[in-house]
């Protein structure tokens, strides 16, 4: 069976890394495990990994925004940032604003790698399933 | 044969959903049908679906912009928004501006699903083939 | 073996097209050659091609930004722009700013095609491996 995941925003995320809806809606999870915000790889190989995060706020103050996909493995002491997007000076002060960050690329992943998504400012994330998501598939 | 599509912007249309060039240029269409703006799935399975839209204008007034990929199937009463990007407060009032929205993710699609792209303001879309496109491929 | 590449930003790029790190870090290069900034296709077929570029600056002057993936083949007289992103009026004058451009789509590539990435303003690109990259894989 094809190893694939597409997880969508979960609005009761209260800490980092982001947590994801893994059951309802347009979710996919096959041949990959989901555990505490992370996608757990169980077969070494090449994977296309992607994520989109939708940031929005009522009154722009241009707080720097970052969106990272990173990897953790108990063999390594430190998280590895695989992909990252940053935004600064992106809206007009005081105005209602909205913006997305999209990341996607190919990586060689190893069994037991855990993949996560991090954002700089959780309160500015909108978790609609069509707007904020995290996924991968094995090539 | 691999089921794949890459359609590019078609500028002489004023209708929603967006219509696409399905014949000339860097277009691909194999094992998938194109009908009235939509990509029609004829084999159930996992697909990576993507779209980019290039918005631009002569004088910024920060009109809210949205870019959606949605699915329609005669079995279901309502369209399903698969992916969406929104932008608000994205340019400096009165200036010439330009911005892109990119969407891409994996979905489990069913034979006879129709996929479309919608935008909130057609007048602000530039249809160059390298800038505005819609595609998918079966994993 | 799967034909795949993921190249990351190389900060000593001084000219166009962009040059890439093809050896160290989270780089992948298998069944595809890298030559003077370009990915060289050696087997005709369908490829998903992607790139992200991270632009940033100390003081916004809204210099128009462009990010292109283009193709060159000795059989054709002119470069073919496959995908392009443009940004204008994207930050507040005088402020420190940061923004990304992401491109990704499917193309039918031919043996000996050379793929490159071009940007309008090299001095505004940040080359961190997680932020600026260029890749592809054969479907």
């Amino acid at each position: 069976l094809r190893k694939v995941a597409h997880l969508t925003g979960k609005s009761n995320s209260r800490s980092m890394p982001l947590e994801w809806e893994d059951t309802y809606g347009i979710v996919l999870l096959s041949g990959v495990k989901y555990k505490k915000g992370g996608l757990v790889i169980n077969e070494t190989g090449l994977y296309f990994v992607y994520s989109k995060v939708y940031f929005r706020g009522q009154s722009c103050n241009n707080l720097p925004l970052s969106h990272k996909v990173y990897m953790r493995n108990s063999k390594y002491p430190q998280d590895l940032v695989m992909m990252e997007g940053k935004m600064m000076s992106y809206c007009t002060t005081g105005q209602m604003w909205a913006r997305s960050s999209y990341l996607g690329a190919v990586f060689n992943l190893t069994s037991a790698d855990h993949l996560y998504v991090n954002v700089s400012e959780l309160s500015l994330v909108n978790f609609e399933e069509s707007q904020t998501f995290f996924g991968l598939y094995k090539l | 044969l691999r089921k794949v599509a890459h359609l590019t912007g078609k500028s002489n249309s004023r209708s929603m959903p967006l219509e696409w060039e399905d014949t000339y240029g860097i277009v691909l269409l194999s094992g998938v049908k194109y009908k009235k703006g939509g990509l029609v799935i004829n084999e159930t399975g996992l697909y990576f679906v993507y779209s980019k839209v290039y918005f631009r204008g002569q004088s910024c007034n920060n009109l809210p912009l949205s870019h959606k990929v949605y699915m329609r199937n005669s079995k279901y009463p309502q369209d399903l928004v698969m992916m969406e990007g929104k932008m608000m407060s994205y340019c400096t009032t009165g200036q010439m501006w330009a911005r892109s929205s990119y969407l891409g993710a994996v979905f489990n699609l069913t034979s006879a699903d129709h996929l479309y792209v919608n935008v909130s303001e057609l007048s602000l879309v530039n249809f160059e083939e390298s800038q505005t496109f819609f595609g998918l491929y079966k994993l | 073996l799967r034909k795949v590449a993921h190249l990351t930003g190389k900060s000593n790029s001084r000219s166009m097209p962009l040059e890439w790190e093809d050896t160290y870090g989270i780089v992948l290069l298998s069944g595809v050659k890298y030559k003077k900034g370009g990915l060289v296709i050696n087997e005709t077929g369908l490829y998903f091609v992607y790139s992200k570029v991270y632009f940033r600056g100390q003081s916004c002057n809204n210099l128009p930004l462009s990010h292109k993936v283009y193709m060159r083949n000795s059989k054709y007289p002119q470069d073919l722009v496959m995908m392009e992103g443009k940004m204008m009026s994207y930050c507040t004058t005088g402020q420190m700013w940061a923004r990304s451009s992401y491109l990704g789509a499917v193309f039918n590539l031919t043996s000996a095609d050379h793929l490159y990435v071009n940007v309008s303003e090299l001095s505004l690109v940040n080359f961190e491996e997680s932020q600026t990259f260029f890749g592809l894989y054969k479907l």
Epitope: - | S11, N12, S13, R14, E121, S123 | -
Partner: antibody
Framework: QVQLVQSGAEVKKPGSSVKVSCKAS????????ISWVRQAPGQGLEWMGW????????QYNENFKGRVTITADKSTSTAYMELSSLRSEDTAVYFC????????????WGQGTLVTVSS | EIVMTQSPATLSVSPGERATLSCRAS??????????IHWYQQKPGQAPRLLIY???HLESGIPARFSGSGSGTEFTLTISSLQSEDFAVYYC?????????FGQGTKVEIK
């Protein structure tokens, strides 16, 4: 900058036709609708119809019962509104306005053309 | 067709005061994304000028004392502190479907 310049005032007899022009500049003529809106003396605004110069498609307000025809000439970036079978109650200022296709608000207006229908 | 009803027909306000104009649609002009209502200002002998689009968005070049609100069928245009140049007729217009229709207008006059 965006400009819409209309033709001059007209005096017409009942039963005749009038054709008002609207020359656009400062933007891509084929990417926006041109709408026509009229205003009778001391009255409110009434939308008559639109044309999309990109493909020539048009839509009309049924209140005008086939009396109105809107056309566009891409080569000169000019839109035209022709109203036939004129009657005294058609005396009004006729405005052309650029409108965004989807949002359909009128963001730039011509200066107006007074059409007087009198015997 | 959707009928747009504005109230009051005339509003007498002193310079510096707040003005609140209402517009009611005979059926909803909102979707999940936007409310398709726009406000215009017209002065004698001039073409209308767009002030607010999609119920609450200020058009480029329009002073921040103008604001719009509402959804569904009830909409409001507010002028926070009337200036002499604001005395004019104001129209709402919907673009939810064809035909586009305008309200009959509210005249804001000096008290």
């Amino acid at each position: 900058q965006v400009q819409l310049v209309q033709s001059g005032a007209e005096v017409k007899k009942p039963g005749s036709s009038v054709k008002v022009s609207c020359k656009a500049s400062g933007y891509t003529f084929t990417r926006f609708d041109i709408s026509w809106v009229r205003q009778a003396p001391g009255q409110g605004l009434e939308w008559m119809g639109w044309i999309f110069p990109g493909d020539g498609s048009s839509q009309y307000n049924e209140n005008f019962k086939g009396r109105v025809t809107i056309t566009a000439d891409k080569s000169t970036s000019t839109a035209y509104m022709e109203l036939s079978s004129l009657r005294s109650e058609d005396t009004a200022v006729y405005f052309c306005a650029r409108s965004l296709i989807s949002t359909a608000m009128f963001d730039h207006w011509g200066q107006g053309t007074l059409v007087t229908v009198s015997s | 067709e959707i009928v747009m009803t504005q109230s009051p027909a005339t509003l007498s306000v002193s310079p510096g005061e707040r003005a609140t104009l209402s517009c009611r649609a005979s059926k909803s002009v909102s979707t999940s994304d936007f409310s398709y209502i726009h406000w215009y200002q017209q002065k004698p002998g001039q073409a209308p000028r767009l002030l607010i689009y999609l119920a609450s968005h200020l058009e480029s070049g329009i002073p921040a004392r103008f604001s719009g609100s509402g959804s569904g069928t009830e909409f409001t245009l507010t002028i926070s502190s009337l200036q002499s140049e604001d005395f004019a007729v104001y129209y709402c217009q919907h673009s939810r479907e064809l035909p586009r229709t305008f309200g009959q207008g509210t005249k804001v006059e000096i008290k």
